[in-house]
Protein backbone atom coordinates (compact mmCIF):
# COMPACT_ATOMS: atom_id res chain seq x y z
CA UNK A 1 0.00 0.00 0.00
CA UNK A 2 2.58 2.57 1.09
CA UNK A 3 5.73 0.98 -0.29
CA UNK A 4 7.47 2.27 -3.37
CA UNK A 5 9.11 5.60 -3.96
CA UNK A 6 9.86 7.66 -0.89
CA UNK A 7 8.52 10.63 -2.78
CA UNK A 8 5.28 9.16 -4.16
CA UNK A 9 1.93 10.34 -2.87
CA UNK A 10 0.45 7.98 -0.39
CA UNK A 11 -3.33 7.75 -0.54
CA UNK A 12 -5.62 6.25 2.10
CA UNK A 13 -2.90 4.92 4.38
CA UNK A 14 -2.94 3.99 8.06
CA UNK A 15 -1.99 6.37 10.85
CA UNK A 16 1.51 7.63 11.64
CA UNK A 17 3.99 6.33 14.21
CA UNK A 18 4.13 7.87 17.66
CA UNK A 19 5.51 11.45 17.57
CA UNK A 20 4.80 11.88 13.87
CA UNK A 21 2.05 14.25 12.81
CA UNK A 22 -0.36 13.14 10.10
CA UNK A 23 -1.44 15.67 7.53
CA UNK A 24 -3.12 14.63 4.30
CA UNK A 25 -1.47 11.43 3.12
CA UNK A 26 1.88 11.90 4.84
CA UNK A 27 3.52 11.79 8.25
CA UNK A 28 5.78 14.60 9.46
CA UNK A 29 8.36 14.52 12.23
CA UNK A 30 9.49 17.82 13.79
CA UNK A 31 12.74 17.23 15.62
CA UNK A 32 13.44 18.20 19.20
CA UNK A 33 17.22 18.16 18.84
CA UNK A 34 19.45 19.87 16.28
CA UNK A 35 21.81 18.46 13.66
CA UNK A 36 23.69 19.67 10.63
CA UNK A 37 21.98 19.20 7.24
CA UNK A 38 23.70 15.92 6.27
CA UNK A 39 23.06 14.35 9.66
CA UNK A 40 19.43 15.47 9.55
CA UNK A 41 19.08 13.76 6.17
CA UNK A 42 20.71 10.62 7.58
CA UNK A 43 18.34 10.66 10.56
CA UNK A 44 15.32 10.71 8.25
CA UNK A 45 16.65 8.04 5.87
CA UNK A 46 17.28 5.64 8.75
CA UNK A 47 13.60 5.91 9.62
CA UNK A 48 12.23 5.15 6.14
CA UNK A 49 11.62 8.81 5.50
CA UNK A 50 13.32 11.79 3.87
CA UNK A 51 14.06 15.39 4.75
CA UNK A 52 10.94 17.39 4.03
CA UNK A 53 10.24 17.88 0.32
CA UNK A 54 7.43 20.42 -0.05
CA UNK A 55 5.26 19.87 -3.10
CA UNK A 56 3.32 23.13 -3.28
CA UNK A 57 2.39 26.38 -1.54
CA UNK A 58 -0.58 24.75 0.16
CA UNK A 59 1.63 22.20 1.93
CA UNK A 60 4.16 24.90 2.79
CA UNK A 61 1.49 27.17 4.32
CA UNK A 62 0.10 24.34 6.40
CA UNK A 63 3.49 23.31 7.75
CA UNK A 64 4.42 26.89 8.63
CA UNK A 65 1.55 26.90 11.14
CA UNK A 66 3.57 24.37 13.18
CA UNK A 67 6.83 26.33 12.96
CA UNK A 68 8.27 29.20 14.97
CA UNK A 69 11.02 31.73 14.25
CA UNK A 70 13.52 28.88 14.62
CA UNK A 71 14.69 27.44 11.31
CA UNK A 72 14.39 23.74 10.45
CA UNK A 73 16.34 21.85 7.82
CA UNK A 74 14.36 20.60 4.84
CA UNK A 75 15.32 18.54 1.79
CA UNK A 76 16.41 21.49 -0.30
CA UNK A 77 19.90 22.22 -1.64
CA UNK A 78 21.55 24.62 -4.03
CA UNK A 79 23.25 22.39 -6.56
CA UNK A 80 23.48 24.59 -9.67
CA UNK A 81 20.08 25.96 -8.67
CA UNK A 82 17.78 25.18 -5.76
CA UNK A 83 16.48 21.63 -5.97
CA UNK A 84 14.53 19.35 -3.68
CA UNK A 85 15.97 16.01 -2.68
CA UNK A 86 13.64 14.26 -5.15
CA UNK A 87 15.36 16.20 -7.95
CA UNK A 88 12.56 18.68 -8.65
CA UNK A 89 13.35 22.39 -8.85
CA UNK A 90 12.11 24.92 -6.30
CA UNK A 91 9.50 26.74 -8.37
CA UNK A 92 6.65 27.83 -6.10
CA UNK A 93 8.50 29.94 -3.55
CA UNK A 94 11.47 32.24 -3.16
CA UNK A 95 14.40 31.46 -0.87
CA UNK A 96 16.43 34.22 0.75
CA UNK A 97 20.19 33.87 0.87
CA UNK A 98 22.92 36.07 2.27
CA UNK A 99 25.94 34.23 0.91
CA UNK A 100 27.02 31.81 -1.81
CA UNK A 101 28.29 29.39 0.88
CA UNK A 102 24.72 28.95 2.17
CA UNK A 103 23.79 25.95 0.07
CA UNK A 104 21.25 24.13 2.24
CA UNK A 105 17.62 25.08 2.68
CA UNK A 106 15.71 25.70 5.90
CA UNK A 107 12.19 26.80 6.74
CA UNK A 108 10.57 28.78 9.52
CA UNK A 109 7.13 30.32 9.97
CA UNK A 110 8.09 33.20 7.68
CA UNK A 111 9.47 31.24 4.72
CA UNK A 112 12.52 29.61 3.21
CA UNK A 113 16.08 30.60 4.05
CA UNK A 114 19.46 29.41 2.78
CA UNK A 115 21.94 28.48 5.46
CA UNK A 116 25.42 27.01 5.86
CA UNK A 117 24.95 23.22 5.87
CA UNK A 118 27.17 22.76 8.96
CA UNK A 119 24.94 24.77 11.28
CA UNK A 120 22.97 22.62 13.75
CA UNK A 121 19.23 23.24 13.31
CA UNK A 122 16.01 21.40 13.99
CA UNK A 123 14.73 19.42 11.02
CA UNK A 124 11.55 17.97 9.51
CA UNK A 125 11.20 14.43 8.13
CA UNK A 126 8.35 13.33 5.89
CA UNK A 127 7.15 9.85 5.00
CA UNK A 128 4.21 7.68 4.05
CA UNK A 129 2.42 5.98 6.91
CA UNK A 130 2.97 2.24 7.12
CA UNK A 131 0.52 -0.53 7.87
CA UNK A 132 2.56 -1.97 10.75
CA UNK A 133 3.03 0.36 13.67
CA UNK A 134 6.78 0.70 14.09
CA UNK A 135 8.02 3.26 16.59
CA UNK A 136 9.77 5.08 13.79
Amino acid sequence: LCQGSNYSTCASCPSCPDRWMKYGNHCYYFSVEEKDWNSSLEFCLARDSHLLVITDNQEMSLLQVFLSEAFCWIGLRNNSGWRWEDGSPLNFSRISSNSFVQTCGAINKNGLQASSCEVPLHWVCKKCPFADQALF
Epitope: K35, N38, S39, D48, A134, L135, F136
Partner: antibody, heavy 120, light 107 residues
Framework: QVQLQQSGAELVRPGASVKISCKAF????????INWVKQRPGQGLDWIGY????????NYNQKFKGKATLTVDKSSSTACMELSSLTSEDSAVYYC?????????????WGQGTLVTVSA | DIVMTQSQKFMSTSVGDRVSITCKAS??????VVWYQQKPGQSPKLLIY???NRYTGVPDRFTGNGSGTDFTLTISNMQSEDLADYFC?????????FGAGTKLELK
Protein backbone atom coordinates in the same frame (compact mmCIF):
# COMPACT_ATOMS: atom_id res chain seq x y z
CA GLN B 1 13.82 -4.33 32.56
CA VAL B 2 15.94 -3.32 29.58
CA GLN B 3 19.10 -5.37 29.26
CA LEU B 4 21.74 -5.86 26.60
CA GLN B 5 23.68 -9.10 27.01
CA GLN B 6 26.91 -9.35 25.01
CA SER B 7 28.88 -12.44 24.02
CA GLY B 8 32.05 -13.43 25.85
CA ALA B 9 35.67 -12.36 25.40
CA GLU B 10 37.47 -13.37 22.20
CA LEU B 11 41.14 -14.08 21.54
CA VAL B 12 41.81 -13.97 17.80
CA ARG B 13 44.76 -14.11 15.43
CA PRO B 14 45.86 -11.13 13.33
CA GLY B 15 44.16 -11.16 9.92
CA ALA B 16 41.21 -13.21 11.17
CA SER B 17 37.60 -12.07 11.70
CA VAL B 18 35.41 -12.14 14.78
CA LYS B 19 31.66 -11.81 15.26
CA ILE B 20 30.31 -10.53 18.56
CA SER B 21 26.67 -10.44 19.58
CA CYS B 22 24.30 -8.33 21.67
CA LYS B 23 21.03 -9.90 22.77
CA ALA B 24 18.23 -7.55 23.81
CA PHE B 25 15.77 -8.17 26.63
CA UNK B 26 12.93 -6.16 28.15
CA UNK B 27 11.84 -4.03 25.20
CA UNK B 28 10.57 -4.29 21.61
CA UNK B 29 13.76 -5.03 19.69
CA UNK B 30 12.71 -3.35 16.43
CA UNK B 31 11.88 -0.06 18.16
CA UNK B 32 15.40 1.02 19.09
CA UNK B 33 18.58 1.48 17.11
CA ILE B 34 21.55 -0.61 18.24
CA ASN B 35 24.77 1.40 18.39
CA TRP B 36 28.27 -0.04 18.71
CA VAL B 37 31.09 1.72 20.52
CA LYS B 38 34.79 0.81 20.76
CA GLN B 39 37.00 1.49 23.77
CA ARG B 40 40.71 0.79 23.69
CA PRO B 41 42.35 0.11 27.08
CA GLY B 42 42.69 3.35 29.03
CA GLN B 43 41.32 5.38 26.15
CA GLY B 44 38.19 7.20 25.07
CA LEU B 45 35.11 5.98 23.25
CA ASP B 46 34.76 5.62 19.49
CA TRP B 47 31.33 5.38 17.85
CA ILE B 48 31.35 2.64 15.18
CA GLY B 49 27.82 3.04 13.87
CA TYR B 50 24.24 1.96 14.33
CA UNK B 51 21.70 -0.40 12.81
CA UNK B 52 17.95 0.08 12.77
CA UNK B 53 16.60 -3.42 13.54
CA UNK B 54 13.23 -2.52 12.00
CA UNK B 55 14.55 -2.07 8.47
CA UNK B 56 18.22 -3.08 8.63
CA UNK B 57 19.40 0.45 7.81
CA UNK B 58 22.99 1.05 8.87
CA ASN B 59 24.98 4.21 9.43
CA TYR B 60 28.75 3.69 9.85
CA ASN B 61 31.46 5.98 11.07
CA GLN B 62 33.63 6.27 7.92
CA LYS B 63 36.60 5.23 10.03
CA PHE B 64 35.06 1.76 10.52
CA LYS B 65 33.67 1.18 7.04
CA GLY B 66 35.17 -2.05 5.71
CA LYS B 67 36.23 -3.01 9.24
CA ALA B 68 32.84 -3.48 10.94
CA THR B 69 29.66 -5.03 9.56
CA LEU B 70 26.45 -4.65 11.55
CA THR B 71 23.57 -7.11 11.27
CA VAL B 72 20.47 -8.09 13.25
CA ASP B 73 18.44 -11.24 13.72
CA LYS B 74 14.93 -10.09 14.61
CA SER B 75 13.76 -13.61 15.49
CA SER B 76 16.22 -13.80 18.39
CA SER B 77 16.35 -10.06 19.21
CA THR B 78 20.10 -10.15 18.60
CA ALA B 79 22.43 -7.64 16.99
CA CYS B 80 25.84 -8.70 15.73
CA MET B 81 29.01 -6.94 14.71
CA GLU B 82 31.64 -8.64 12.61
CA LEU B 83 35.16 -7.22 12.62
CA SER B 84 37.42 -8.28 9.78
CA SER B 85 41.16 -8.26 8.95
CA LEU B 86 42.00 -7.84 12.61
CA THR B 87 45.17 -6.12 13.79
CA SER B 88 46.45 -5.16 17.24
CA GLU B 89 44.65 -1.80 16.79
CA ASP B 90 41.36 -3.68 16.97
CA SER B 91 42.12 -5.01 20.46
CA ALA B 92 39.50 -3.27 22.57
CA VAL B 93 36.28 -3.59 24.52
CA TYR B 94 33.26 -3.31 22.24
CA TYR B 95 29.93 -2.16 23.61
CA CYS B 96 26.43 -2.24 22.18
CA UNK B 97 24.18 0.56 23.39
CA UNK B 98 20.69 1.93 22.86
CA UNK B 99 19.10 5.26 23.70
CA UNK B 100 15.73 3.64 24.44
CA UNK B 101 14.22 6.85 23.12
CA UNK B 102 14.54 6.37 19.37
CA UNK B 103 14.68 10.07 18.63
CA UNK B 104 17.86 10.85 20.52
CA UNK B 105 21.42 9.59 20.46
CA UNK B 106 22.02 9.51 24.17
CA UNK B 107 22.90 6.00 25.27
CA UNK B 108 20.94 5.11 28.39
CA UNK B 109 21.49 1.35 28.16
CA TRP B 110 24.79 -0.41 27.48
CA GLY B 111 25.87 -4.01 27.20
CA GLN B 112 28.54 -5.20 29.60
CA GLY B 113 31.15 -5.07 26.82
CA THR B 114 33.03 -7.74 24.88
CA LEU B 115 36.81 -7.78 25.12
CA VAL B 116 38.48 -8.63 21.81
CA THR B 117 42.20 -9.38 22.00
CA VAL B 118 44.15 -9.70 18.77
CA SER B 119 47.36 -11.62 19.32
CA ALA B 120 49.55 -14.10 17.48
CA ASP C 1 34.36 15.05 12.06
CA ILE C 2 33.63 17.15 15.12
CA VAL C 3 36.40 16.89 17.70
CA MET C 4 35.38 16.99 21.37
CA THR C 5 38.31 18.15 23.49
CA GLN C 6 38.52 17.43 27.22
CA SER C 7 41.71 19.28 28.02
CA GLN C 8 42.18 17.84 31.50
CA LYS C 9 42.95 14.13 31.37
CA PHE C 10 43.20 13.92 35.18
CA MET C 11 41.77 16.04 37.96
CA SER C 12 42.62 15.71 41.66
CA THR C 13 39.70 16.30 44.00
CA SER C 14 38.62 15.86 47.62
CA VAL C 15 35.30 14.76 49.04
CA GLY C 16 33.03 17.81 49.34
CA ASP C 17 34.78 19.73 46.54
CA ARG C 18 33.04 21.48 43.68
CA VAL C 19 34.48 20.00 40.48
CA SER C 20 34.04 21.34 36.95
CA ILE C 21 34.96 19.23 33.93
CA THR C 22 35.13 21.02 30.61
CA CYS C 23 34.55 19.89 27.05
CA LYS C 24 35.10 21.94 23.90
CA ALA C 25 33.62 21.13 20.48
CA SER C 26 35.58 21.97 17.34
CA UNK C 27 32.43 23.54 15.86
CA UNK C 28 28.98 24.62 16.97
CA UNK C 29 26.98 21.62 18.22
CA UNK C 30 24.07 23.58 19.67
CA UNK C 31 22.97 21.95 22.92
CA UNK C 32 23.37 18.36 21.75
CA VAL C 33 25.99 17.34 24.31
CA VAL C 34 25.74 14.25 26.52
CA TRP C 35 27.87 13.36 29.57
CA TYR C 36 28.70 9.84 30.77
CA GLN C 37 30.34 8.46 33.88
CA GLN C 38 32.42 5.28 33.69
CA LYS C 39 33.88 3.39 36.62
CA PRO C 40 36.70 0.82 36.17
CA GLY C 41 35.46 -2.44 34.67
CA GLN C 42 31.97 -1.03 34.07
CA SER C 43 30.01 0.26 31.08
CA PRO C 44 29.45 4.02 30.77
CA LYS C 45 26.40 5.47 32.52
CA LEU C 46 24.35 8.36 31.14
CA LEU C 47 24.39 11.42 33.40
CA ILE C 48 23.36 14.50 31.40
CA TYR C 49 21.71 14.92 27.99
CA UNK C 50 20.94 17.96 25.83
CA UNK C 51 23.79 19.75 27.67
CA UNK C 52 21.87 20.42 30.88
CA ASN C 53 19.16 17.78 31.49
CA ARG C 54 19.82 15.30 34.27
CA TYR C 55 18.99 11.71 33.34
CA THR C 56 16.55 9.74 35.51
CA GLY C 57 18.05 8.75 38.87
CA VAL C 58 21.15 10.94 38.56
CA PRO C 59 21.84 12.84 41.83
CA ASP C 60 21.21 16.58 41.66
CA ARG C 61 24.82 17.34 42.58
CA PHE C 62 25.54 16.70 38.86
CA THR C 63 24.74 19.64 36.60
CA GLY C 64 25.58 20.35 33.00
CA ASN C 65 25.63 23.58 31.08
CA GLY C 66 26.87 25.23 27.93
CA SER C 67 25.89 25.53 24.30
CA GLY C 68 27.61 26.08 20.99
CA THR C 69 31.18 24.94 21.58
CA ASP C 70 31.83 25.13 25.34
CA PHE C 71 30.33 22.72 27.84
CA THR C 72 30.80 21.99 31.53
CA LEU C 73 29.85 19.15 33.84
CA THR C 74 29.87 20.25 37.49
CA ILE C 75 29.77 18.04 40.57
CA SER C 76 28.76 20.40 43.39
CA ASN C 77 29.60 18.21 46.36
CA MET C 78 32.10 15.56 45.36
CA GLN C 79 31.48 12.09 46.83
CA SER C 80 33.89 9.15 46.88
CA GLU C 81 31.51 7.20 44.61
CA ASP C 82 31.97 9.93 41.97
CA LEU C 83 35.61 8.90 41.37
CA ALA C 84 35.43 7.77 37.76
CA ASP C 85 36.10 8.74 34.15
CA TYR C 86 33.76 11.32 32.59
CA PHE C 87 33.17 11.57 28.85
CA CYS C 88 31.32 14.13 26.76
CA UNK C 89 29.65 13.24 23.44
CA UNK C 90 28.11 15.33 20.67
CA UNK C 91 24.94 14.31 18.77
CA UNK C 92 24.88 17.19 16.30
CA UNK C 93 26.72 15.50 13.47
CA UNK C 94 27.58 12.00 12.30
CA UNK C 95 29.86 10.39 13.16
CA UNK C 96 28.90 10.83 16.80
CA UNK C 97 32.09 11.69 18.66
CA PHE C 98 33.27 11.54 22.27
CA GLY C 99 35.84 13.40 24.28
CA ALA C 100 38.94 11.50 25.42
CA GLY C 101 37.71 11.55 29.01
CA THR C 102 38.62 13.17 32.32
CA LYS C 103 39.57 10.95 35.25
CA LEU C 104 38.73 12.17 38.75
CA GLU C 105 41.19 11.05 41.40
CA LEU C 106 41.52 11.71 45.11
CA LYS C 107 44.14 14.27 46.18
Amino acid sequence: QVQLQQSGAELVRPGASVKISCKAFGYTFTNHFINWVKQRPGQGLDWIGYINPYNGYTNYNQKFKGKATLTVDKSSSTACMELSSLTSEDSAVYYCAISYDGYYERFAYWGQGTLVTVSA
Amino acid sequence: DIVMTQSQKFMSTSVGDRVSITCKASQNVGSTVVWYQQKPGQSPKLLIYSASNRYTGVPDRFTGNGSGTDFTLTISNMQSEDLADYFCQQCSSYPLTFGAGTKLELK
